[in-house]
């Protein structure tokens, strides 16, 4: 029997979760309101693009200073300077030694749709979340996780795969989005920025968070990922934003403390099993949900995205460790490993709580603009 995560069930380290309602509290303009100067051709040049210019913005090779400060929502300027976009170009990389189109990376050529045509699909991820436009769906019940508290043995593989750090999860981690919507966790990985530059994939009203965790799941209706790719609901990802807080997050420290061992691209190490649920926010009842895609090639669609309303707090030092330890291809730092936000193209993001009603204190009479489709339809 699955038990929903309780509010008072605080994660390791005195609570890794952030504010209860951090999303949608600031009335910042969306990135689509920003000027679009110096926009090179690339995957993000699609009709209805909602993102900033995708300048070729590879991470710097030289070491960074220790004085990294994560941006807070209230510290953000209302409009990004046109010449200084936060996005790296949303392209792939053609390996110099050959013409292998599957050798993609963040920044460079060729565009991702040339690597995988699905990357030019109409229902891609990540997206910008606008709480006031989300459809409140009371049918979206608290997420249920079972078996996420892993014993130290067997150990888990932690790998620098050149575009993220990935923890491969063992069998037995079960997650339910609702009745009859059951999944098994496969792996988790992170996306981050660089010094003073946030790197979450999803944004909220144009605001980009310091980092983001993705826990990838396979529907129990499928035995293997290759069978589920591109099938509606075949894969599901739980996503949470990581923010700077005053204390060290001990759950994350179990992974971050091992990053130096896998600094080199392709390297891996074994880490003791840990409480995977402690890496997520404690409130499993408040979240946004929509259907999108994988955020890296092959960009297969049909992925159910669940983005927590509550954030997870890491110390400034931990966020610095995340963004400043790993190396990627071509002797460059593994940084800014996020895809540009993609157009919704008519999709409606659903919310398990009335996000549009109570999350914007500036609106005199807030109105829920979109209605909910029955969960599971």
């Amino acid at each position: 029997q699955r038990l929903p995560r309780m509010q008072e069930d605080s994660p390791l380290g005195g609570g890794s979760s952030g504010e209860d309602d951090p999303l949608g509290e600031e009335d910042l303009p969306s990135e689509e309101d920003s000027p679009r100067e110096e926009d090179p051709p690339g995957e993000e040049d699609l009709p209805g693009e909602e993102d900033l210019p995708g300048e070729e913005d590879l991470p710097e090779v030289k070491p960074k200073s220790e004085e990294e400060g994560s941006l807070k929502l209230e510290d953000l300027p209302t409009v990004e300077a046109p010449g200084d976009p936060q996005e790296p170009q949303n392209n792939a990389h053609r390996d110099k030694e050959g013409d292998d189109q599957s050798h993609w990376r963040y920044g460079g050529d060729p565009p991702w749709p040339r690597v995988s045509p699905a990357c030019a699909g109409r229902f891609q991820s990540p997206v910008d979340i606008r709480p006031q436009l989300a459809a409140f769906c009371p049918a979206l019940r608290p997420l249920e996780l079972l078996g996420f508290q892993l014993p130290p043995l067997p150990e888990l593989r932690l790998r620098n795969n050149g575009h993220s750090v990935q923890l491969t999860l063992p069998p037995g981690l079960e997650m339910a989005l609702g009745p009859g919507r059951e999944y098994r966790a496969l792996q988790l990985h992170l996306h981050w920025g660089a010094a003073g530059r946030p790197g979450s994939e999803h944004t909220v009203e144009g605001h980009r968070f310091p980092a983001e965790i993705h826990v990838v799941h396979l529907s129990t209706a499928f035995a293997r990922v290759d069978e589920a790719l591109g099938r509606p609901g075949g894969l599901a990802v739980l996503a949470a934003f990581l923010e700077e807080g005053p204390e060290e997050n001990s759950a994350y420290e179990q992974l971050l403390s091992r990053l130096e061992e896998i600094a080199e691209e392709g390297s891996e190490t074994q880490v003791p099993g840990l409480d995977i649920s402690a890496l997520l926010p404690s409130d499993f009842s408040r979240y946004f949900q929509y259907e999108g895609s994988l955020t890296t090639p092959p960009c297969a669609q049909g992925v159910i995205w669940t983005v927590f309303n509550q954030t997870v707090m890491l110390s400034a030092k931990q966020l610095h460790t995340l963004s400043d330890t790993l190396w990627g291809p071509g002797d460059s730092r593994l940084q800014l490993n996020f895809r540009a936000t993609q157009p919704l193209n008519g999709r409606v993001i659903e919310a398990s709580f009335p996000a549009g009603v109570d999350s914007s204190p500036r609106a005199a009479e807030p109105v829920q603009l979109n209605s909910c489709l029955a969960a599971g339809d």
Epitope: D100, G328, P329
Partner: nanobody, 117 residues
């Protein structure tokens, strides 16, 4: 359904060479192209150990014990990853397994390499 098939194993003399192949079949969405692919090996009575890995960016990484002797490469047009093994030693004797890591692990059945005179 994706299946990995290793080949190229066999008996080889010390100092000799061998090339292992790992071919993916039944790959409708071609996830093999987007997987980090690794060769692991397991000698009798020992734990499985990482030999070499090639990432989706073409980056390669080798265990210290094979560095300078083994080379991993991939040909995505053939859905195949190779492990070129030179200057083989008796301690390289093991069953060699191919692993493709794309959201989940895919494993081959293994191919035996025996280095002996």
């Amino acid at each position: 359904e994706v299946q990995l098939l290793e080949s190229g194993g066999g008996l080889v003399q010390p100092g000799g060479s061998r090339r292992l192949s790992c071919a993916a079949s039944g790959n409708s969405v071609n996830i093999f192209s987007f997987a980090a692919v690794a060769w692991y090996r397991q000698a009798p009575g020992k734990q499985r150990e990482l030999v070499a890995v090639i990432t989706t960016t073409g980056g390669t990484k080798y265990s210290d014990s094979v560095k300078g002797r083994f080379t991993i490469s991939r040909d995505s047009s053939k859905n195949t990853v190779y492990l070129q093994m030179n200057s083989l030693r008796a301690e390289d004797t093991a069953v060699y397994y191919c692993n493709a890591d794309y959201l989940q692990d895919y494993w081959g059945q293994g191919t035996q390499v025996t280095v002996s005179s």
